[in-house]
């Protein structure tokens, strides 16, 4: 007895497609070994048609695929555009040769069944409507017209010209004639269901002189589109239901036994399991819309259906489109924290993954908002200016080539809590969702800037100090000047090292920045932060106002501008090797070209492109010397 299992018999008709699932025992070897589908010949030899190693035979080219689902211990063979030539005996199996573990599958492809020669075939999808044409001779013009549906013994009336209507067709069937043409009548049936499929007879007149026409109505379920997505990636369901439902509410639901549970609709309903990671976007006036889901989970796999109805809920007899979503757990998308925690006044550094093959793609960060159909306005991007309300507290650091960019948000408030998306204008599968949780601060911040009231006087020297705890010894400290294009790290170089010491005075660790002489361009936001290589840690922000010598030096800071920072990420490392540094920082950034702001994230990453040239982040055109002092006692 073979341990492989699948359907022994598959019967289909020409033009249809099959999706054959083969189950294999749950072992590591089985999950990773070659999977194949072969056709058995008279000699007993089995000729490979497709395998998981990438082989595809000529006769299957463009119409078949084989996909392994190691987490389910199954693999699936999809074959489209079947012909009678596909009838035969096959094997699905595992192993390096076609003599490994296998299972026999018989595939029979028949011709579409023959119908009486005068039968007119109408093929329609569920939920659509059909207009049946019934010709008749002029002499039967005054006679009764009717349409009936054949049952085993009789023909059950659907509708006739005396306005008799079968109860199951009330409100769905209409019998009418067009213009002055007295040789044809029409019957329109709307909201078709599987039960409407079958043979019908339309008739004009009675007895032997009656005109009759045979009609075969085929009502088809939409074939599910197969979607294969990686864990943590995103999927877009593109739904095109047609103009006739353009004005109806739209929905996406997931099959669950007898019901289809609505995940989202355009009336504001949303499944809590998809909070923060779903958008529904109407596309045009023709009934097209799309649903984007990010941060795919294993449990998101299943049968999905989109549809339209005034209730925003699935209704029998309304048009639908279906998908089977498979979620592959062997994902290329790195497993990152989906929840980031911060405290009021503190900061968070969020590492956003992107496809490393697309290091030059534009990177964005948007905030998911659930009102209406859901939307995700971009807050910051590689070439998108920071939104005004985030001035001085949000920046994106791109680290080309390593598959990660970092978004830093500081001066946190509880209103910052919510869902955020990392995305690029490249591979849309790499959209990821982060939930930011902000708790009330309960202790002193790790980084603290003095003086808190930072007003520098034009032409003079001005120093600000950033105090940090011992645990940040081993980390690189930096100051950067913020602009709405980013936070330009002020360059520094080591000017000699001090001998190692194992002591650390908690109160006296600081890194200072000196502006000498102060110029008008120095006005603005500055950040003090820590990082380890390309991994950014905490930051705190300060606004430095610049006043002329003649004026008093009192200055009203922007609200919360120099709020104390709090711990968001806690490193436990304390490095005992300490070096004395004096660094000269000479900010000399290049100008940025103007770029349009990206307002919103829909479901096409391409829509998120912004024009403009990349360059170093903002700053001054003059050469000024900023000094960073590390004082160790």
């Amino acid at each position: 007895k073979s341990p492989i299992f699948g359907p022994q018999e598959v019967s289909s008709i020409e033009g249809d497609s099959v999706s054959i699932t083969c189950y294999y025992p749950d072992t590591s070897v089985n999950r990773h070994t070659r999977k194949y589908w072969c056709r058995q010949g008279a000699s007993g030899m089995c000729t490979t048609l497709i395998s998981s190693n990438g082989y595809l035979s000529k006769e299957y080219s463009g119409r078949a695929n084989l996909i392994n689902f190691p987490e389910n211990n199954t693999f699936v063979i999809n074959i489209e555009q079947l012909t009678q030539d596909d009838t035969g005996s096959y094997k699905c199996g595992l192993g390096t040769s076609n003599r490994g573990l296998s299972f026999d599958v018989s595939l029979e492809v028949s011709q579409v069944p023959e119908l009486p020669s005068d039968t007119h075939v109408y093929t329609k999808d569920i939920g659509r409507n059909v207009t049946i044409e019934c010709p008749f001779k002029r002499e039967n013009a005054p006679s009764k017209k009717s349409l009936c549906k054949k049952t085993n013994q009789s023909c059950e009336l659907v509708i006739d010209s005396t306005e008799k209507v079968n109860p199951s067709y009330i409100g769905r069937a209409k019998l009418f004639m067009k213009g002055t043409d007295l040789t044809v009548f029409y019957v329109n049936i709307s909201h078709l269901t599987h039960n409407d499929a079958g043979l019908y007879i339309c008739q004009a007149g009675e007895g032997p002189s009656a005109d009759k026409k045979n009609v075969d109505l085929q009502v088809l379920a939409p074939e599910p589109e197969l979607l294969y997505k990686d864990l943590r990636s995103s999927v877009t369901f593109e739904c095109d239901l047609g103009r006739e439902v353009a004005n109806e509410a739209k929905y996406l639901c997931r099959m669950n036994k007898e019901t289809c549970d609505v995940i989202i609709n355009t009336l504001g309903k949303r499944d809590p399991d998809f909070e923060g990671r779903i958008l529904i976007t109407p596309k045009d006036d023709n009934g097209r819309f799309s649903v984007l889901i990010t941060g795919l989970r294993k449990e998101d796999a299943g049968h999905y259906q989109c549809g339209a109805h005034s209730s925003g809920l699935p209704q029998e007899g309304w048009p639908i489109q279906t998908w089977q979503l498979f979620v592959n757990e062997e994902s290329t998308i790195p497993n990152r924290r989906s929840v980031v925690k911060g405290v009021t006044g503190g900061s968070v550094a969020i590492a956003c993954p992107y496809n490393p093959k697309e290091s030059s793609s534009l990177k964005y960060w948007c905030r998911w908002e659930g009102d209406g159909n859901g939307h995700c306005p971009v807050l910051v991007g590689t070439q998108a200016q920071v939104q005004e309300e985030y001035e001085g507290r949000l920046a994106l650091f791109d680290q080309p080539g390593n598959g990660t960019y970092t978004v830093i948000l500081n001066q946190l408030t509880t209103e910052d809590a919510g869902f955020y998306w990392c995305l690029t204008n490249g591979d849309s599968r790499w959209r990821t969702t982060i939930e930011l949780q902000v708790a009330e601060a309960t202790r002193e911040p790790n980084l603290e800037v003095t003086p808190q009231n930072a007003t520098a006087v034009l032409g003079e020297t001005f120093t600000v100090s950033c105090h940090y705890p011992c645990k940040f010894y081993s980390q690189e400290k930096y100051w950067c000047k913020w602009s709405n294009k980013g936070c330009h790290i002020l360059p520094s170089h080591d000017e000699g090292a001090r001998q190692s010491s194992v002591s650390c005075d908690q109160s006296s660790q600081l890194v200072s920045m000196t502006l000498n002489p102060v110029s008008k361009e120095d006005e603005g936001w500055y950040w003090c932060g820590v990082k380890q290589g390309q991994t950014y840690g905490e930051t705190t922000a300060i606004y430095i106002a610049v006043e002329e010598r003649t004026r008093g030096s009192s200055h009203v800071n922007p609200t919360d501008a120099n709020a104390r920072a709090k711990v968001a990420l806690e490193e436990e490392v304390v490095d005992s090797s300490i070096s004395e540094k004096e660094n000269k920082a000479i900010p000399n950034p290049g100008p940025f070209a103007n770029e349009r702001e990206i307002q919103n994230v829909g479901d096409q990453a391409q829509e998120n492109r912004a024009s403009g040239d990349a360059g170093s982040a903002d700053g001054q055109s003059r050469s000024s010397s900023s000094k960073h002092h590390h004082h160790h006692h």
Partner: nanobody, 125 residues
Framework: QVQLVESGGGLVQAGGSLKLACAAP????????MGWFRQAPGQEREFVAA???????????YYADSVKGRSTISRDNAKNTMYLQMNSLKPEDTAVYYC???????????????WGQGTQVTVSS
């Protein structure tokens, strides 16, 4: 209310035939994988056969080794009914036969969603 109602069971001599039927009023029949399971006295319930339909022209039939070649499963989607034609019956086919309906997903025989009350099939030697 979903109900699965089996019929067609009975007493038959070894070598004889029986056709079991399962009616599923109230079920969106076309969306379901339909199956037959059986349970002999003192034994676990075991899989017999199952059938899927893709809503178009394709049917997938699954059989347990014990009935393969002797049984044929079919379904009439218009009548919401499934059938199991059993030929060359053996005494070891004696059991209560249950009709079941399950979502068509990858791990299908991990569990069916709806079950009938069962119909007794007795094969005498």
């Amino acid at each position: 209310q979903v109900q699965l109602v089996e019929s067609g069971g009975g007493l038959v001599q070894a070598g004889g035939s029986l056709k079991l039927a399962c009616a599923a009023p109230g079920l969106t029949f076309s969306s379901y994988r339909m199956g037959w399971f059986r349970q002999a006295p003192g034994q676990e319930r075991e899989f017999v056969a199952a059938i899927d339909w893709n809503g178009r022209g394709t049917y997938y039939r699954y059989y347990a080794d014990s009935v393969k070649g002797r049984s044929t499963i079919s379904r009439d989607n218009a009548k919401n009914t499934m059938y199991l034609q059993m030929n060359s019956l053996k005494p070891e086919d004696t059991a209560v036969y249950y009709c079941a309906a399950g979502s068509i997903d990858l791990n299908w025989y991990g569990g069916m969603d709806y079950w009938g009350q069962g119909t007794q099939v007795t094969v005498s030697s």
